[in-house]
């Protein structure tokens, strides 16, 4: 795993000092993977908590930084950085030394194998005439007297070292803060030197440069500021990871910069670069991290302390030893991957004297079957041979090896082959969000296989037809639109994968049906009158510019600022004009407005109306009769309200054609010592509706309806006329 | 061919009044919405006041309601915004334009404006 | 009130590049959205209404995208003839509020 944890131990000062995790894997950052996690691990060294909470800062999803440290302690102690996915998932550990302890190591961190004895060396920086007490992880393990210290240092030798060895240690001054011991880190590789694999019967690579062979994948972890399956490549000054793909921040390139990779590695210094703070370049003759290796160059070759020897003309090898007539396989990727099922066609270069010729040219496969070349280019400086390779399978992914063979000697180069199964989504997509002719959908879905995902192919059609499927290609970290679609329709849409390389699609995901919306009523109404019908109660009125395309009814929404509720009447009618609301609140002030809706789609409000409702009026008067005086005139009668809350300022009088459909009609008695009126204008041998409220403040209930019916031409009423002059206007509209 | 004018702009006191007009000509005005959108100088557009059709319903920005009044003559095609206790950030260009009747929302018809100047 | 926000607040871009102007709203206002352009001293003119329609007569370099809370407002190939101030404006409830404008010049 392409895991780096970097300390920069060029800042003294805690509140500048950081530490930033960078993850290089291919297709780090998938939604799928969990995020890298950067933290103090306090299980083994435990200082007090920070004075203020660690912060993160997270560059995208492949690198995290944690700063926020207020004083020295904060930074003592073991770090952690945990990235990747699954059976991948790794943790890189880091621990911090206090630049101001009493004991400090000569050597942080220690990769020994199964078997052999460790020493864990520790120089006395503040003398303290105290035991010296060892720990591992935490516990006790063994006591020094203060005057066993050979030339100024406590060691501690462990024979015979296993697995269960590896962890942390510490020493410790009897009696001393726990924040001036000296920290370690012990990894103890699963296998002897050179072994790794189950039972430890496989033969690690050769890992070149001071990288450490996995024991469990055979893998060589290369030191920063190397590259290859063998760590064969040194990277350009100032460039680490697996690829060499990041670069060390800053104008002073890695000085001062602890890395710590995955186990067995642990830490050292960037290449070129030496010293507890990684401040020191090498001394002449030395390379690489932590100046561990020696140049011995031959043949006039010249020590870089970055790269190691640099060959003049005429020779190559790790030490310039070999001469350029022995034959040399040319440049080649370290690292190649394919997809499962192609057949790809690998290439080989080689110079040399004798020439290479067709014949002198193989491929190995980790199977140990050989492959010959189908095809030869041979140009100047050199000959390329080209491999046909059948079909690939999972089986094929390992070592393979070119090896080039003439009189003047052989060389092999070995380079690593992943073969990789293209993703196939296991979900269908995710609905985001719809309208009326568009879909907004989540191409981002679980899948089997490998990523990196390269594209993503999305292909829909309506549901239950026969017609092609609509592609598109997307963006996989973009939410996608599916545009110009139809209104109220089910599209069944499914999501196909592909990752980089021929052969990279995978196969069709499951589908999801998705139904785009109604569409939207575009009309917007008018509120053409509102009448408060009572305390309570309010007849809306509105209209649309034209008849609606597309609607279900009217929202009218009714806002009481004053007490910040919302009240919505649904009037799921498209023809409706009007409508009564009812069980409002008196004395209330409300915004009113009135919008089409379709489906689940509001249309656009008409501008608000502001009604203001009265306080709750009388009760009803009471006893209302009716008696018809001739073909156009009835009169009523009532008796005043019983104990109405103030004076009566005016009676109203509701009149209604009984069985008909039109509005009613309202007159005012403005005399309020008036119980009686004579409704006139009325037509002949028609039923009416008679109804009426007092006024005080508010408009009152109404009083129990009466039905009378006007005389037919001719005939006059045998009963008294008792006529109010209040009653003299005809009929309100 | 639809035409909008508008008239009444000028100089005013603060605190002072103005009754804005814009005549309306080459559609059937009763059928139409109208609003009113002011620019002060240099400064982007804001939406100011809404009637309906009939005139029955109206709207307003908060920052005029309580001071101006939308209003409209449909015998008359003409549309009004008497506009009272002026302020010198009402200094603006008034513009008259007609609302949509639906569907296509944006106003597509505008007059020419009428210079309103606020200052003592 | 609806507050709708336009960025940038002013650009300038070469002859022939694609422009893109953003407007968005501080609530969802489905698809009720007008562009309009103004040049020094003139009135606005309508580009586009509800939300992606391109009014007659405009050039069919002008596109307008998006519903809900962000809409886009963009010129495929920049003339010299577009400088102007560009302007958003919704109609999904009252007051029908604009955005503060986006002046666009050429390089």
């Known amino acids: 795993v392409d895991l780096t944890l970097l300390a920069n131990l060029r800042i003294t000062d805690p509140q500048r000092f950081f530490l930033t995790c960078v993850s290089g894997e291919a297709g780090a950052g998938r939604s799928s993977d969990p995020p890298l996690l950067l933290e103090k691990d306090d299980r083994i060294v435990r200082t007090f908590p920070p004075g203020q909470p660690l912060y993160l800062a997270r560059n995208g999803s492949h690198q995290v930084t944690l700063r926020g440290f207020s004083k020295p302690s904060d930074l003592v102690g073991v770090f952690s950085c945990v990235g990747g996915a699954g059976a991948r998932r790794t943790r890189v550990l880091y621990v911090h030394n206090s630049p101001g302890a009493h004991l400090f190591p000569d050597k942080v961190t220690h990769t020994v194998n199964k078997g052999d004895t460790a020493v864990l060396s520790a120089h006395v920086h503040k003398e303290k005439q105290t035991d010296v007490i060892w720990k591992n992880n935490g516990s006790y393990f063994n006591t020094l007297d203060w005057q066993e210290a050979d030339d100024g240092r406590f060691q501690l030798q462990l024979q015979n070292v296993q697995p269960p060895s590896s962890g942390i240690y510490s020493a410790t001054y009897l009696e001393a803060s726990p924040l001036g011991s000296a920290f370690f880190r012990l990894i103890v590789r699963g296998c002897g030197a050179g072994r790794w694999g189950p039972g430890c019967v496989k033969d690690c690579p050769g890992c070149l440069h001071g990288g450490v062979c996995h024991d469990h994948d055979g893998e060589c972890v290369c030191p920063p500021g190397f590259t290859g399956t063998r760590c064969e490549q040194a990277c350009r000054e100032g460039r680490f990871g697996q690829s060499c793909q990041e670069q060390c921040p800053g104008t002073a390139g890695c000085r001062g910069l602890t890395f710590c990779l995955p186990d067995p590695y642990g830490c050292s210094c960037g290449s070129g670069w030496r010293g507890s703070q990684c401040q020191e370049a090498c001394a002449p003759g030395h390379f690489g991290a932590d100046c561990r290796l020696q140049c011995q160059c031959q043949n006039g070759g010249t020590c870089d302390r970055f790269s190691g020897c640099v060959c003049p003309s005429g020779w190559h090898g790790v030490h310039c030893e070999k001469s350029d007539r022995i034959p040399q396989i040319l440049s080649m990727a370290t690292e190649v991957e394919f997809n499962i099922g192609t057949m790809p066609r690998i290439n080989c270069a080689a110079a040399g004297n004798p020439f290479p010729v067709r014949g002198s040219m193989k491929l190995r496969k980790p199977d140990g079957t050989m492959l010959l070349s189908t095809k030869v280019i041979v140009e100047p400086d050199r000959t390329t041979a080209e491999f046909e390779v059948p079909s690939l399978t999972l089986g094929d992914s390992g070592f393979w090896e070119c090896r080039v063979s003439t009189s003047g000697g052989q060389d092999s180069r070995r380079f690593k082959v992943n073969v990789k199964v293209p993703p196939v989504p296991l979900t269908a997509p995710r609905l985001l969000a719809k309208q009326s002719r568009q879909l907004v959908v989540s191409p981002l879905v679980s899948f089997s296989g490998d990523g990196p995902i390269s594209s993503v192919r999305l292909h829909y059609r309506p549901q239950d037809s026969t017609i092609a499927w609509s592609a598109i290609v997307v963006d996989p970290s973009e939410n996608v639109t599916l545009m110009n679609l139809k209104p109220k329709t089910g599209y069944n849409v499914r999501v196909q994968l592909s990752r980089p390389g021929e052969g990279g699609e995978g196969g069709w995901g499951p589908s999801a049906l998705m139904t785009t919306d109604c569409p939207e009523p575009l009309l917007q109404p008018w509120l053409e009158s509102w009448h408060v019908e009572g305390p309570d109660r309010l007849r809306v009125s509105w209209s649309l510019p034209s008849v609606p395309l597309s609607g279900d009814g009217f929202l009218l929404r009714l806002w009481d600022g004053a007490r910040g509720q919302e009240r919505r009447e649904n009037i799921s009618f498209p023809q409706a004009r009007t409508a009564l609301l009812t069980g409002l609140t008196p004395g209330t002030h409300y915004q009113l407005d009135v919008r089409l809706y379709h489906c689940t789609l509001l249309g656009p409000a008409s501008p608000p109306a502001h009604v203001h409702l009265p306080p709750s009026g009388p009760p009803a008067p009471r006893h209302l009769h009716a008696q018809a005086l001739s073909d156009s005139e009835i009169q009523l009668m009532w008796q005043h309200p019983e104990a109405p809350s103030g004076p009566i300022s005016k009676y109203i009088v509701e009149i209604q054609v009984a069985g008909g459909s039109g509005d009613p009609q309202w007159m005012d008695v403005d005399r309020p010592e008036e119980t009686s009126i004579i409704v006139r204008g009325l037509n002949a041998s028609t039923r009416y509706l008679f109804r009426v409220r007092a006024s005080v403040q508010g408009l009152g209930d109404w009083s129990n309806t009466v039905e009378e019916a006007t005389l037919g031409n001719g005939l006059q009423s045998e009963g008294p006329v008792r006529e109010s002059r209040a009653a003299e206007e005809g009929l309100d509209q | 061919e639809v035409q909008l004018l508008e008239s009444g702009g000028g100089l005013v006191q603060p605190g002072g009044s103005l009754r804005l007009s814009c005549a309306a000509s080459g559609f059937t005005f009763s059928m139409y919405g109208m609003v009113w959108v002011r620019q002060a100088p240099g400064k982007g557009l804001e939406w100011v006041s809404v009637?309906?059709?009939?005139?029955?319903?109206?709207g307003y920005a908060d920052s005029v309601k309580g001071r101006f009044t939308i209003s409209r003559d449909n015998s008359k095609n003409t549309l009004y915004l008497q506009v009272n206790s002026l302020r010198a950030e009402d200094t603006a260009v008034y513009y008259c334009?007609?609302?949509?009747?639906?569907?296509?929302?944006?106003?597509?018809?505008w007059g020419q404006g009428t210079l309103v100047t606020v200052s003592s | 009130d609806i507050q709708m926000t336009q960025s940038p607040s002013s650009l300038s871009a070469s002859v022939g590049d694609r422009v893109t102007i953003t407007c968005r709203a501080s609530q969802g206002i489905g698809h009720y959205l007008a562009w309009y352009q103004q040049k020094p001293g003139k009135v606005p003119k309508l580009l586009i209404y509800t939300a992606s329609t391109l009014q007659s007569g405009v050039p069919s370099r002008f596109s307008g995208s998006g519903s809900g809370t962000d809409f886009t407002l963009t010129i495929s190939s920049l003339q010299p003839e577009d400088v102007a101030t560009y302007y958003c404006?919704?109609?999904?409830?009252?007051?029908?509020?604009f955005g503060q404008g986006t002046r666009l010049e050429i390089k």
């Open positions: 404006q919704q109609f999904n409830s009252y007051p029908h509020t």
């Open positions: 334009a007609r609302a949509p009747r639906g569907y296509s929302y944006g106003y597509y018809y």
């Open positions: 009637i309906s059709p009939s005139g029955g319903n109206t």
